[in-house]
């Protein structure tokens, strides 16, 4: 019976068996619902919306890493509908903490204003360099510098959303 079907299965009335929901392709996310025994009649997939990506399957599209606004890093590879963005070295005025375990967001660049003396990325950096950083036009993420208390809970930003 359909109550025995799994998270991504629906009950096929014809065969009397649980059947896999049709998975979405890369760059798509589910439209309507399927799983735990039920499937909407028009269940299907839609392309990922702005600034999100998906590897396919049953996952909703996730936000690209915000290299500049959140990580304070350069963009090595911009994301597309099928791939996340890849971040490069820190932006001018920011540095990477050495020998620090990665947090749940990966490596984050920190302001040179907070750097120990003689930090190589910060030598010659002006104090103003870290005060101005690029943001996402028209929409915003919450950065660990603005909302450090939210970083630990996994809420309030978009690095892995």
């Amino acid at each position: 019976e359909y109550s025995n079907c799994g998270e991504n299965e629906y009950y096929n009335q014809t065969t009397g068996l649980c059947q896999e929901c049709p998975p979405c392709g890369p760059g798509e996310e589910p439209y309507l619902s399927c799983g735990y025994g039920t499937k909407d009649e028009d269940y299907g997939c839609v392309p990922c919306p702005a600034e999100k990506f998906s590897k396919g399957g049953y996952q909703i599209c996730r936000r690209h890493k915000d290299c500049e606004g959140f990580f304070r890093a350069t963009v090595l590879t911009p994301g597309d509908m099928e791939n996340d963005a890849e971040c490069g070295p820190c932006l001018p005025g920011y540095y990477m903490l050495e020998n620090r375990p990665r947090n749940i967001y990966g490596m984050v660049c920190y302001s040179c204003l907070l750097a120990p003396p003689n930090t190589k990325e910060c030598v010659g950096a002006t104090s103003g360099a870290s005060a101005n950083f690029p943001g996402t036009s028209g929409s915003s993420t919450l950065s660990p510098f603005q909302h450090a208390h939210k970083e630990l809970s996994g809420q309030g930003h978009l690095a892995t959303a």
Partner: antibody, heavy 115, light 107 residues
Framework: EVQLEESGPELVKPGASVRISCKAS????????MHWVKQGPEKSLEWIGE????????IYNQKFEAKATLTVDISSSTTYMQLKSLTSEDSAVYYC????????WGQGTLVTVSA | DIVMTQSPSSLSASLGDRVTISCSAS??????LNWFQQKPDGTIKLLIF???SLHSGVPSRFSGSGSGTDYYLTISNLETEDVAIYYC?????????FGGGTKLEIK
Amino acid sequence: EVQLEESGPELVKPGASVRISCKASGYSFTDYWMHWVKQGPEKSLEWIGEINPSTGGIIYNQKFEAKATLTVDISSSTTYMQLKSLTSEDSAVYYCTRSGGFPYWGQGTLVTVSA
Amino acid sequence: DIVMTQSPSSLSASLGDRVTISCSASQGISNYLNWFQQKPDGTIKLLIFYTSSLHSGVPSRFSGSGSGTDYYLTISNLETEDVAIYYCQQYSKLPYTFGGGTKLEIK
């Protein structure tokens, strides 16, 4: 059947805050982003932001970043939006709507800001 | 932000008519366009997603078309229940933005 049930109307004083809710049912809550949309008296629609219940990730329209705070309670499949420092400009109907094409919408919550 | 301009802002048509509503984006939106219907009681429903895909349960007299910056919602064989305000919405670039709406009335 998928349903998005929003909380009831609110009458609040200028400068105060209000929290409205959107309770989802009929689908796996953590599988979709939840969006919030504002409709002012002139009837135009404005996208406020969205929250991913599975990660807590949030995207705001910059225009509303200082005004709205989105949160989620997975245990009750409910998304919340808090609006702060309210003025008459915030008097509007607020809708929640689900990602994946925006196929489902709540019935709307009327917020009236008046002294 | 991408500006979505709808036209006309209001229109009156007769039962059985074919009606077309236009939506113009300030830049290309690559077919990332939805159409919504808002009934007089405030209820909002998705009609068309991704320019031309008909949402589940929506009558086939509704259709969507367009590309680049110009998009269209067509209602053929207008019925009384189609009295509503219609909105387009782009989701090509954040923040997602809506058109100003088109109020459809029956003559």
